[in-house]
Every structure is written in C-alpha cells, then in structure tokens.
C-alpha cells in the first residue's frame, strides 16, 4: 500500500520522488533569485547617474564676466550654489563642455543689471551670442540675440553637439549683466542621439 500523501511507491526506486524533492526548492530558489535580481537591477537603474543613461543635462548660473577685451560670460553650477547642476557636461574655466554626442536643447536667459529701456537702446548694440568656440574646426554661432528696447533676452534652440564641443556665451556692449539666478541662466539638455 502506498503511504498516504507520499506520492511515492515504497516498492519502486524513489527517483521521481527524489527528483521532485530536489526540483521544488531548486525552482523556488530560481524564482526567488530572479525576483531579487530584477529588484536589484531596477534599483541599480534608479541609482545610475542621468549621464550614464544618456540624459546629459546642465543648468548654470552666472559666476562673473570676463576681464576687459574678453566678452565671454563665465558660468558656475552645482547643488551647493542653489538650483544649478551638471550631469554629464562639465565646466572648463567657466565654459560648458559637452561629453556626449547628440541633439541638445540649448537655452539661455540674460538680464542686464544696470539697464533701463532707454539705456538698452542708447547703448546699442548690446548682443548675446552662444556658439561652439572649441575645437576651432567646429566653431560656429548657434544663437544671436540683441537687447533692443528691453533689459532681458531669452531664447532656445535644438542643435547637434559633439563630445568635446565647448560652448561660449559672448556678451558684447557696455551693460553689466545680473547675477540673480532667476534672471540669468544657461543650460543644455540632451534630447536624442
């Protein structure tokens, strides 16, 4: 008589029984391992920096203007400075350098601190240009804006950028820009390869 509920005949060799007894914990272990592995992978994905996922992004605030004869604006970024950050791109002497090829949204706003509508027109031309300034072989203007009657300009555009491109923001004219973080800022966002 077979033992009740054993599922194994006493007279037969218990291969099926042994196999079943071994397979059940093995399958259970594999399932648990799979669940744990998926959870850990998901956590690892969440903890990965944005740049490793391809989402290179930077938002910068004005640090200072250049010395005489240097029209460039010098930028700074980082959590300690407030609402500015760099994930992927980096700053090289206050200029933004791209680390990943792709199409980027480039945006900028600049407000002049010493300015009125009459000043802006009187001190014409005051212009802001954003461009690739190095390497020299890729040098090109990406954005050009003029302060005609106002004290603030803002613009954005999509443009392809390559690893190693350094973006420069040139402010020409005699009007001092504001360093207020809600008035003057510059950033890029990777959109697609």
């Amino acid at each position: 008589m077979p033992e009740e509920g054993s599922g194994c005949s006493v007279r037969r060799r218990p291969y099926g029984c042994v196999l079943r007894a071994a397979l059940v914990p093995l399958v259970a272990g594999l399932v648990i391992c799979l669940v744990v592995c998926i959870q850990r992978f998901a956590q690892a994905q969440q903890q990965l920096p944005l740049e490793s996922l391809g989402w290179d992004v930077a938002e910068l605030q004005l640090n200072h203007t250049g010395p005489q004869q240097d029209p460039r604006l010098y930028w700074q970024g980082g959590p300690a400075l407030g609402r500015s950050f760099l994930h992927g791109p980096e700053l090289d002497k206050g200029q933004l350098r791209i680390h990943r090829d792709g199409i980027y949204m480039v945006h900028i706003q600049v407000t002049l601190a010493i300015c009125s509508s009459t000043t802006a027109s009187r001190h014409h031309p005051t212009t802001l240009a954003v461009g690739i300034c190095s390497p020299a072989s890729r040098s090109i203007s990406l954005l050009r804006l003029s302060f005609h009657q106002g004290c603030t300009i803002a613009s954005q555009r999509l443009t392809p950028l390559a690893r190693g491109d350094t973006l420069c923001t040139n402010l020409t004219g005699t009007l001092l820009p504001s360093r207020n973080t809600d008035e003057t800022f510059f950033g890029v966002q990777w959109v697609r390869p």
Epitope: P67, A113, S178, R179
Partner: antibody, heavy 120, light 109 residues
Amino acid sequence: EVQLVESGGGLVKPGGSLRLSCAASGFTFSSYSMNWVRQAPGKGLEWVSLISSSSRFIYYADSVKGRFTVSRDNAKKSLYLLLNSLRAEDTAVYYCARGDYSNYPYFDYWGQGTLVTVSS
Amino acid sequence: EIVLTQSPATLSLSPGERATLSCRASQSVRSSYLAWYQQKPGQPPRLLIFGASSRATGIPDRFSGSGSGTDFTLTISRLEPEDFAVYYCQQYGDSPALTFGGGTKVEIK
C-alpha cells in the same frame, strides 16, 4: 566682518591730482562690483563711479567723466580712484561702497570715507 | 538722467510715531529698482531697503518700503530714538547715472 577702509584724501589745489585707495577685507573682493560715492559738506550723496568685479564694466557720473579714473587690484583686494583736474566742487568725503552680489548697483557696505578738500 | 525728489525735506515727529517718507522719480524706475539708506551725523550711509521693498540684512521690520513706477515710500511704523537721521532714496534702474534723492531729515519734535 566686511570692512572697507579709504585713504589718500587731503588738501589739494584746483587743477591738482589725488589718488584715493580703499582696502577691503572680510569678503571675496574679486566677486563684487565696487563703487565710489561722495558727499560734499552738509550736502546729499552723489554716486561717482562703478567698476565691475573683473574691471570690464566701468561707469562714471557725468560730473567726473574724463577727469576721474577708477581701477581695482583683486589680488591686493584694493579699489582706487585717481582724481585729476580737481575743482572746488569736488570737495567732499569720498566713500568706497560695495555693490550687491547680484551686480545691481545698490550699496550694502560702506567705508568711513576720506575727505578731499580742493582749495587754493 | 532720472531725478529723484524726496519729500518732505524735514519731518518732525516724536518717538513711537509713524513716519512716512516719499520719493518721486522724474520717469519710471525699472521694475521697482529703488533703494533707501539711513545716514546719521559723522557716519556713512546704511542700506535699509533694496528693490523698493526688500529689507537689507539686519534691518528691523519696523522699516518697510513700497511703491512702483515713479512713486515710492519708506515707512517707519514706530520711531525709535535711534531712527532720527537723514534718509536717502536711490534709483539703480538707469545707467550710467545712478542717482540719489536730496534726502529727508527725520528730527525729534
């Protein structure tokens, strides 16, 4: 503690020259625009000049344009004002004043001032 | 050049009273970019208010600024003995002429 100390004032004849200095301490001098503001005896305040942190942007009041020259040495944390072709109406206490970090030209810290007297 | 006119030239009040000082610009001052300073005899000016209504660091809340366009006001809600001084408004919305008003003297009645 932010400190601004002016020096170089004194008695000078009309047409003469003088160089004022302002020694700064207690803050990152190279990050701030700096200004000169003057006050004639018993009168109100008159802004004279502004120089940006990197010296790229320099502004003067019309009354001193072409006669006064502002400069700074960030390494020495010093601000200067060279006064040429002095007139009797330039007689005043000259204050060195720090501009706001935002670059907006209002003056959050002032020195005690140095007196310039132009008289024959 | 923007001209700032302060009124009254002199304000005679007692401690505990409210002081209202006016500053009028000859043309609109950009986005309320106007400052107020206090000056006591033999001392340099002290920044009280910037951006027309923002109190500078360490300034007591009895000082308040308001206004926009061409009309601005400095209010001292309850005068303390140390508040008797000369007050100047300054505009910094135009360049290169950053101008001060002629001042209002707040004296003890």
